[in-house]
């Protein structure tokens, strides 16, 4: 037993090095030590994480990717360990350090908001949806007048920057709009965005931020809401958000507003349609919301209300579509 | 309680129309979708198509399209399929199915609610 | 149209015994997927939707599970009453499709 042996000593990786490969994506890279005795043996390594935060995790490879944000700069050390049942054996450690970019912190954007709509896809013979993003940001408290801010974000390998700004009243790009994008909204991986920023005046510091695209997307309103009054009933129906997911995905909530006394009636829904019992003199403000729900991923936010639709006295039937 | 009350057996010949009926007490078509399945003697179930009631659209299943139709009368609280050209493969029970419920449970596109199911044999 | 593989066709196995019958689909389906228990000359009978609810009033020792492509319907502690035809609907796409069943018997 090598963990018994008095002797046996193990010895730190060697070349390790932090490469950024992508936007807030970095990629620790290390060999073993070409003097290790007893190369045979089945050695791991322990890599922590020290900066912009704390981590730890065993790995057999030699190489780890980490996304995470790294305007702060990054840090981190491994070290060579020797499992047995009963104990671990570990060599000393190796750091190695990304150095924060240059630029004071007032400098960076602030209040980074991010969110994502399915869209009709440009090539629906492909792929019948994409999703758009939207970003909006706070100009730094200590940016000079003359700065400009740039936006790109990455989802998986594709890295794309913005072509699409809104402006404050200096010229500053303060949104960010892309109409179609490479995001899976109904994907696991996060979305990186990066903002990075030029001045004459100042070394403008730059910001980057992870977003879970579930956490992040904003569900379309239902569709082609219609309601029709029969006999002191309403019917109401709707077909589901603009959306790759299918039909059994989405709950509902049904909103009918009486105009005439203020009374709100909110129904939670699985199914696309509902009868209400009305009185025959009010008139009524019909509006729809659709959320995803649990069979289909972890249940997200609420979307938009549907434009409303009134219906009632001296407006017998009414239907939208939008 | 929900009921679902189909049609007695039909005896159909070759090239002739057979039409089922499905109905529904204690509960409001309008606020449901109709299902109507198929099961051919020691086979599986076969999904034909289904009803909105509301609105009279029907969605088949692409082998049913020039087979079935299917029709519902909210009046009477009845869905109807009618199947045409009958062949002898037609031969099945035929079901009607629905969804009950709204705000728990499984949604509409799930059949919690069938019909005793309807015997359609065609034979010259 | 989604297609659905289910196996074993047909399975037999003795009182209190645990038994799994598997359900496969063509396409990720999202959990919209139910599973029905069908006795010889009656209607079939919803046992679990959204691939691992039970429905209202079914036995406890019925469970489902599985996400994605693959499915499978859990029968603990087999009872009697449990002898039936088990089979498998999609509900992600139109057209609806099932599975081809199985057939479960009691040794």
């Known amino acids: 037993d090598l963990l018994n042996h008095k002797k046996f000593l193990l010895l730190p990786p060697v070349n390790f090095t932090i490469k950024a490969t992508g936007l807030a994506q970095v990629l620790l890279h290390w060999d073993p030590n070409p003097d290790q005795e007893q190369r045979h043996v089945d050695l791991e390594y322990h890599v922590k994480i020290n900066a912009p935060q704390e981590d730890e995790y065993d790995t057999r490879k030699t190489e780890s990717k980490c996304v995470t944000p790294l305007h702060e700069g990054f840090a981190a050390s491994v070290r060579t360990i020797l499992k047995s049942s009963h104990t671990t054996l570990a060599s000393s450690w190796v750091s190695a350090e990304l150095k924060a970019p240059p630029g004071s912190p007032g400098t960076s954007v602030t209040n980074l908001t991010c969110t994502t709509h399915t869209v009709v896809s440009s090539h629906t013979h492909l792929r019948p949806y994409q999703v758009s993003l939207r970003c909006t940001w706070l100009v730094g408290k200590d940016a000079p007048e003359d700065t400009q801010y740039f936006l790109y974000y990455r989802f998986g390998v594709l890295t794309e920057k913005c072509q699409e700004y809104s402006r404050d009243a200096l010229n500053r790009n303060t949104a960010c709009w892309f109409p179609r994008t490479f995001i899976n909204s109904k994907g696991f991986e996060q979305l990186a965005v990066h903002i990075n920023g030029s001045s004459k005046r100042a070394a403008i510091k730059p910001f980057d931020q992870l977003f879970s695209p579930l956490a992040i997307d904003q569900v379309n309103p239902p569709r082609n809401v219609t309601v029709e009054i029969e006999s002191n009933s309403l019917y109401i129906q709707w077909e589901k958000p603009l959306s790759a997911f299918p039909d059994h995905c989405f709950n509902y909530e049904l909103k009918i507003y009486n105009t005439k006394n203020g009374h709100i009636q909110k129904e939670k829904l699985i199914a696309n349609k509902f009868i209400s019992k009305i009185d025959d003199v009010s008139t009524y403000s019909i509006q729809v919301r659709a959320a995803v729900s649990s069979p289909c991923r972890m249940p997200g936010r609420w979307g938009e209300w549907s434009q409303p639709i009134y219906v009632g006295k001296e407006r017998k039937s009414l239907v939208e579509w939008h | 309680e929900v009921q679902l009350q189909q049609s007695g057996a039909e005896l159909g010949k070759p090239g002739t129309s057979v039409k089922l009926s499905c109905k529904v007490s204690g509960y409001n078509i309008k606020n449901t979708y109709i299902h109507w399945v198929n099961q051919r003697p020691g086979k599986g179930l076969e999904w034909i198509g289904r009803i909105d009631p509301a609105n009279g659209n029907p969605i088949y299943a692409e082998k049913f399209k020039n087979k079935a139709t299917l029709t519902a009368d909210t009046s009477s609280n009845t869905a109807y399929m009618q199947l045409s050209q009958l062949k002898s493969d037609d031969t099945a029970i035929y079901f009607c199915?629905?969804?009950?419920?709204?705000?728990?449970?499984?949604?509409?596109?799930?059949?919690?609610?069938w019909g005793q199911g309807a015997s359609v044999t065609v034979s010259s | 149209d989604i297609q659905m593989t289910q196996s074993p066709a047909s399975l037999s196995a003795s009182l209190g015994e645990t038994v799994t019958i598997e359900c496969r689909t063509s396409?990720?389906?999202?959990?919209?997927l139910a599973w029905y228990q069908q006795k010889p000359g009656k209607s079939p009978q919803l046992l679990i939707y959204?691939?691992?609810s039970l429905h209202t009033g079914v036995p406890s020792r019925f469970s489902g599970s599985g996400s994605g492509t693959q499915y499978s319907l859990k029968i603990n502690s087999l009872q009697s009453e449990d002898v039936a035809s088990y089979c498998c609907q999609q509900y992600s796409n139109y057209p609806f499709t099932f599975g081809s069943g199985t057939k479960l018997e009691i040794k």
């Open positions: 959204n691939a691992n």
């Open positions: 396409e990720d389906i999202y959990n919209g």
């Open positions: 199915a629905m969804h009950r419920g709204h705000s728990m449970g499984p949604g509409p596109y799930v059949m919690d609610a």
